[in-house]
């Protein structure tokens, strides 16, 4: 006999919630695998600038993305299938996975906060290397793509430690249109914008992490309530 009333509502709520979660995981995994295997984007992600490889942060980033996508799909499937099948075993595994993920998120949050300066330094180094490559090797479309992504995302251009030729190339080719790099001497310094992102805008990442944590707790509660509901309904 299946669950009834409020518990049934929780069952479908958990199903829909985890179906969306599973889909999102699929999208992330798909994009990550595409980035990993597409030649153009592989060059971009594993950008080797001269004899300097991209910082470790970026090298590892793609695998983190693959892992996140796979875990999201697995956990989403457990929650989805466990809810629709009313399986205490699957829901219990789902709950355990959520607890582990919650612990991982807290650990990642602490690690990220502690290492934010190093991460910011890596990002700045990556930008500088990409910019140097885009200027020295004017055929390096991957490097140009990286530089333009930085410029458009952070609404910045260049840094305060530029060579003459880099300044000229930036002004004419790589700065976002309307950027006042020249009239307002490096006011839109990308190094500064990266620092701002990791210090001033850190609260935004914190808010996002809290939202994810709240959703996780909410899902844990729902899965436990449903599990108890299934146990109780099987007694009668």
């Amino acid at each position: 006999m299946g669950v009834e009333g409020c518990t049934k509502c929780i069952k479908y709520l958990l199903f829909v919630f985890n179906f969306v979660f599973w889909l999102a995981g699929g999208v992330i995994l798909g994009v990550a695998l595409w980035l990993r295997h597409d030649p153009q984007t592989t060059n971009l992600l594993y950008l080797e600038l001269g004899d300097k490889p991209a910082p470790n942060t970026f090298y590892v980033g793609i695998y983190i993305l693959i892992a996140v996508g796979a875990v999201m799909m697995f956990v989403g499937f457990l929650g989805c299938y466990g809810a629709i099948q009313e399986s205490q075993c699957l829901l219990g595994t789902f709950f355990t996975c959520l607890v582990i993920l919650f612990a991982c998120e807290v650990a990642a949050g602490i690690w990220g906060f502690v290492n934010k300066d190093q991460i910011a330094k890596d990002v700045k180094q990556f930008y500088d290397q990409a910019l140097q490559q885009a200027v020295v090797d004017d055929d390096a479309n991957n490097a140009k793509a990286v530089v333009k992504t930085f410029h458009e995302t952070l609404d910045c251009c260049g840094s305060s430690t530029l060579t003459a030729i880099t300044t000229s190339v930036l002004k004419n080719n790589l700065c976002p249109s309307g950027s006042n790099i020249i009239s307002n001497l490096f006011k839109e310094d990308c190094h500064q914008k990266i620092d701002d992102l990791f210090s001033g805008k850190l609260y935004l990442i914190g808010i996002a992490a809290i939202v994810v944590a709240v959703i996780m707790i909410f899902e844990m509660i729902l899965s436990m309530v449903l599990c108890c509901g299934i146990r109780n309904s099987s007694v009668y």
């Epitope: 200027v135 305060s160 030729i165 300044t167 020249i182 009239s183 001497l185």
Partner: antibody, heavy 119, light 112 residues
Framework: EVQLLESGGGLVQPGGSLRLSCAAS????????MSWVRQAPGKGLEWVSY????????DYADSVKGRFTISRDNSKNTLYLQMNSLRAEDTAVYYC????????????WGQGTLVTVSS | QSVLTQPFSASGTPGQRVTISCTGS?????????THWYQQLPGTAPKLLIY???NRPSGVPDRFSGSKSGTTASLAISGLRSEDEADYYC???????????FGGGTKLTVLG
């Protein structure tokens, strides 16, 4: 040994055109930015234009913008400067120079070719 | 009128030390762009003498040295020799004009 040899200079009437060439040897031409710098008789040096290794990036001094065109042929190790609508003030010795990214300066220069604009 | 200002001429006797200044502004030398120095012997093409404010390319004697402070760069020649008689040009990049700029040049005369 790095060598840059300019040619194509001469006497031309105002409004006329001229094409300068610079033959490069002794280094990997296709990997280097190249530039033109000129020097009016008895005067100082004036940067004219630069071109990146694969011709993607170019820039010009305001005084020649729209009249001069810089180009290169990496298969021939040659740099060019097409000069149109020439004026008396364009009279100068035109030097071809290699731009060093590492040094951020013009590290090697040709011997120059004289362009005289006169009626 | 050049963007970078150099003395029109300088002179010294053999063995002496001579300094040539190059004054710019906050849009070139003062903006952090490197200053380079070129030597032009009579009737020849310019030759890179000092790059990146104070670095000497191989083959340039250590009698030549460069420095930079604020908006002014300097070229010092110690143990002056007769073969040092030439025009000396400083060069930087101007971010307002978006061009490579040169000084007007300094004619160095070795006396006696």
């Amino acid at each position: 040994e790095v060598q840059l040899l300019e040619s194509g200079g001469g006497l031309v009437q105002p409004g006329g055109s001229l094409r300068l060439s610079c033959a490069a040897s002794g280094f990997t031409f296709s990997s280097n930015y190249m530039s033109w710098v000129r020097q009016a008789p008895g005067k100082g040096l004036e940067w004219v234009s630069y071109i990146s290794s694969s011709s993607t990036y170019t820039d010009y001094a305001d005084s020649v913008k729209g009249r001069f065109t810089i180009s290169r042929d990496n298969s021939k190790n040659t740099l060019y400067l097409q000069m149109n609508s020439l004026r008396a003030e364009d009279t100068a010795v035109y030097y071809c120079a290699r731009y060093s990214y590492g040094r951020d300066s013009f590290d090697y220069w040709g011997q120059g070719t004289l362009v005289t604009v006169s009626s | 009128q050049s963007v970078l200002t150099q003395p029109f001429s300088a002179s010294g006797t053999p063995g002496q030390r001579v300094t040539i200044s190059c004054t710019g502004s906050t849009s070139n030398i003062g903006a952090g762009f490197d200053t380079h120095w070129y030597q032009q012997l009579p009737g020849t093409a310019p030759k890179l003498l000092i790059y990146g404010n104070s670095n000497r390319p191989s083959g340039v004697p250590d009698r030549f040295s460069g420095s930079k402070s604020g908006t002014t760069a300097s070229l010092a020649i110690s143990g002056l020799r007769s073969e040092d008689e030439a025009d000396y040009y400083c060069q930087s990049y101007d971010t307002n004009l978006s061009v490579w700029v040169f000084g007007g040049g300094t004619k160095l005369t070795v006396l006696g």
